[in-house]
């Protein structure tokens, strides 16, 4: 008794779990003008529909609210919308049009729906650069999520000070006010699809711009071990004629520009070294006094000074008189 018709389009469709898919269906052109009724989508081998527009018909518990018949007889549309796809939706489906008046219905060919693992991951976007102490809005987005699906749950994880901003079906905004110590730490956006019970995440390393917070000088005297000074030092005794290597080191991101000056420089002073290393091959009277290392950075500068006090060799002094 049943009349058969062929579904147009592919024989199988693929969807990632948690996402949506539309199973296309058009009512047969052979349908008599007066034949009308209700539409039913069935899982192959089942007699309870997964979706229907018949108010007197129950649908399968497993698909209720996720599978919808998109019914528009004027446009001959009988498509099936599946949202929050689950692994167990992986099956063959067919459509049936049944009139309450007639003993025969119109049954479509089968179409297979393949549900694959979710491979899409969230995107994290950062507008411009992250600056220490300045709030920035980070957006975690899942543009591949369909609007009609169950809205995903967004979770953020970060050591930096944060607050949650607005969210949509497809995105969540996090306001972050990073500190210098948050540079190179991880920030994770985790997205859970409650309709399918799937979780995806993306982790990025924060690149925080910050001015130098610490500057230090390491001193190498001849072959002796280096020592480090972390604050301005009034006097460092050095033996006359000794080779001295001063190494300046500062934090900050991106790295600060290090330069050495003799004395206490004015802003536009000319450095005696344009790197963090100052070589003094033979300390003499010309080297007695102050040396300053300046760490220059777009977000701020820091400097540290060191005062050299030259000890004269006794024989050297006598020879000079």
């Amino acid at each position: 008794q049943e009349r058969r018709f062929q579904l147009e389009g592919p024989e199988s469709l693929t969807v990632q779990e948690g996402l949506c898919v539309l199973v296309p269906c058009r009512l047969p052109t052979t349908l008599p003008a007066s034949y009308y009724g209700y539409g039913y989508w069935f899982l192959e081998g089942a007699d309870v529909p997964v979706a229907t527009n018949d108010p007197d018909e129950e649908v399968q518990e497993e698909t209720r609210g996720r599978f919808h018949l998109l019914w528009d007889p004027r446009r001959k549309n009988c498509s099936l919308s599946i949202r929050d796809a689950r692994r167990r939706d992986n099956a063959a489906y067919f459509f049936r049009l049944k009139s309450k008046w007639m003993k025969y219905g119109y049954t479509s060919s089968k179409l297979s729906v393949r549900v694959m693992a979710l491979t899409h991951r969230p995107n994290i976007s950062i507008p411009g650069t992250l600056e220490s102490g300045h709030p920035s809005n980070l957006t975690c987005s899942v543009p591949w999520v369909c609007e009609q699906g169950t809205p995903p749950i967004f979770s953020w994880m970060s050591a930096a000070p944060t607050s949650l901003g607005p969210r949509t079906t497809q995105s969540s905004v996090l306001t972050i006010t990073p500190r210098p110590q948050d540079h190179s730490t991880n920030l994770t956006c985790q997205v859970t699809f409650p309709g399918a019970g799937v979780t995806m995440e993306r982790t990025i390393q924060l690149n925080v711009s910050y001015a130098p917070q610490k500057v230090a000088i390491s001193i190498f005297q001849g072959n002796s071990a280096a020592f480090k000074i972390l604050q301005n030092t009034s006097s460092l005794p050095v033996l006359e004629g000794q080779a001295l290597r001063l190494l300046c080191d500062a934090d900050g991101n991106p790295p600060a520009h290090l330069s050495w000056f003799q004395g206490f420089p004015a802003l536009n002073a000319t450095p005696i070294s344009n790197t963090g290393v100052l070589e003094l091959p033979q300390v003499g009277s010309a080297e007695e006094g102050d040396f300053t290392c300046r760490a220059q950075h777009p977000l701020g500068s820091l400097q540290i000074s060191l005062s050299l006090f030259v000890h004269w060799k006794p024989e050297g002094r006598a020879g000079g008189v």
Epitope: S34, Y36, P73, K100
Partner: antibody, heavy 116, light 107 residues
Framework: EVQLVQSGGGVVQPGRSLTLSCAAF????????MHWVRQAPGKGLEWVAV????????YYADSVKGRFTISRDISKNTLYLQMNSLRTEDTAVYYC?????????WGQGTMVTVSS | SYVLTQPPLVSVSPGQTARITCSGE??????ASWYQQKPGQSPMLIIY???KRPSEIPERFSGSNSGSTVTLTISGTQPMDEADYYC??????????FGTGTKVTVL
Amino acid sequence: EVQLVQSGGGVVQPGRSLTLSCAAFGFTFSTYTMHWVRQAPGKGLEWVAVISYDEGFKYYADSVKGRFTISRDISKNTLYLQMNSLRTEDTAVYYCAREASAFDIWGQGTMVTVSS
Amino acid sequence: SYVLTQPPLVSVSPGQTARITCSGENWGQKYASWYQQKPGQSPMLIIYEDTKRPSEIPERFSGSNSGSTVTLTISGTQPMDEADYYCQAWDDSTGGVFGTGTKVTVL
């Protein structure tokens, strides 16, 4: 109580128009397909028109095609039959009926007399 | 157009069985419904989908569909069953179709 209450009948001259109404009570009107059926004096029942619950399907008996229009207003829970170019042979009691598996609920009927 | 033919009159004695036939084409593909109409009243559904009976309809009313003819049977007919009876079906091209109607008289 589930019921259909009809109004709008009367006497009308040939070629004129008339609109019948059928108000639904006690059930979810928007989920049911509705029909109009008529019965000429001393005659049998004659099916007239159908409108599906979603308004996606409308169909008419050949005798009224092009002259009668079936419609519904979900917000008012009301079914209508707009009858144009009326003829003397349209004289009948008109019934609205709800379709479940068949015509399970009927209105009380309203008389339409087409006479010059 | 599609026509459903019924006998105009069926007479039955009280307590006896009345059978009303309704002949038409392709009954094997269609569901039959039956309606009872008493004078001055709206029709009332008594049988749908060939054999099914609404809960408020007495069991003495039953329906059958042989594929060529559908039949309404009233077992143990009572005087209150005196009425006009109409079969009804849906046709692919005509739409809704009612039978010619049968008057049941209880003698």
